[in-house]
């Protein structure tokens, strides 16, 4: 019975971009400006997201899909669907409550977002440090000391840090 009723429900014929208008005898009406319905059979249209302030429009709202926001330069997205914008820091830094702070010795951040992470522990994998870490770069692990030919130097100085490093995603 439920299935039969749903097949007879006139609202089920209303496609995305429309809503089933109870005030007009359940006729499918187009979504009003600045609203959308992404699925068929909707009884209302949803209000479009507005990208204001630190948010900027990545994709305009259409009758069938919501607007999508990203962040203005100097900020990056956080949360599902870019629900927040967070300030960028420089490589070699992390964002704290007091602003951008340099990574402590033994940690690095090769992006403009996120936290300072400890350098990789190469010995965990039986490897040795091939290139030293910096505030901006992780170490590069190399073969275990036993794999090195006699007299070969195992550690390379770090490559000079350059901008741009890992781009904010």
């Amino acid at each position: 019975f439920e299935r039969t009723r749903s097949l007879q429900d006139p609202c089920s014929n209303c496609p995305a971009g429309t809503f089933c208008d109870n005030n007009r005898n359940q006729i499918c009406s187009p979504c009003p400006p600045n609203s959308f319905s992404s699925a068929g059979g909707q009884r209302t249209c949803d209000i479009c997201r507005q990208c204001k302030g630190v948010f900027r429009t990545r994709k305009e709202c259409s009758s069938t899909s919501n607007a999508e926001c990203d962040c203005t330069p100097g900020f990056h997205c956080l949360g599902a669907g870019c629900s927040m914008c967070e300030q960028d820091c420089k490589q070699g830094q992390e964002l704290t409550k007091k602003g951008c702070k340099d990574c402590c010795f033994g940690t690095f951040n090769d992006q403009k977002r996120g936290i300072c992470r400890p350098w990789t522990n190469c010995s965990l994998d039986g490897k040795s440090v091939l290139v030293n870490g910096t505030k901006e770069r992780d170490v590069v692990c190399g073969p275990s000391p036993a794999d090195l030919s006699p007299g070969a130097s195992s550690v390379t100085p770090p490559a000079p840090a350059r901008e741009p490093g890992h781009s904010p995603q």
Epitope: G114, T120, D138, V139, V140, C141, P164, S167
Partner: antibody, heavy 119, light 107 residues
Amino acid sequence: QVQLVQSGAEVKKPGASVKVSCKASGYTFTSYWINWVKQAPGQGLEWIGNIYPSDSYTNYNQKFKDKATITADKSTSTAYMELSSLRSEDTAVYYCTRDYGSAYSMSTWGQGTTVTVSS
Amino acid sequence: DIQMTQSPSSLSASVGDRVTITCQASQDISNYLNWYQQKPDKTVKLLIYYTSRLRSGVPSRFSGSGSGTDFTFTISSLQPEDIATYFCQQGDTLPYTFGQGTKLEIK
């Protein structure tokens, strides 16, 4: 030895979703980045994104930001990639990879999972 | 994104030949350049990392050189088992990007 074993081939209809798994063994799962890489038929390799399982921090290639969701389950040492709203151009082999010790190279590759999108 | 231009796209050589593949980055990537081998069965293996470092267990006939934007991968004496497609990849900047690949065949 270090191993990444991926789930089997999938055939999906357009508009559907698929979740590919990558089970890691032979190392401390939480200490290395897991990457996902796409190879469309007859094409080259494209980096989709990665995850650091210790805290589930992710990076995405902007191109795949609305397509792929990467997650990790520390309790089973398994990484996942879910692809949504599948289209024919998502037909490809998807690889998971582990870094070599620091994120800058990929030392271990899974065997690949073929995802076919066809109506 | 950093573009990686790999050449040639295909190459036919004889057993024992010296084979060279080049990879050019659209901007300076320091030494964060890796080379991978993809066999016909689709298995992928890291051969060289950080421009010139040979992965443990990889035969010494494989080598790499370069820095900045220009990189070279060499097989000093081609063996039948080297039939594969070879890819370069930059690990300097997200998103990581690959060259288009070089398909190597035996004459």
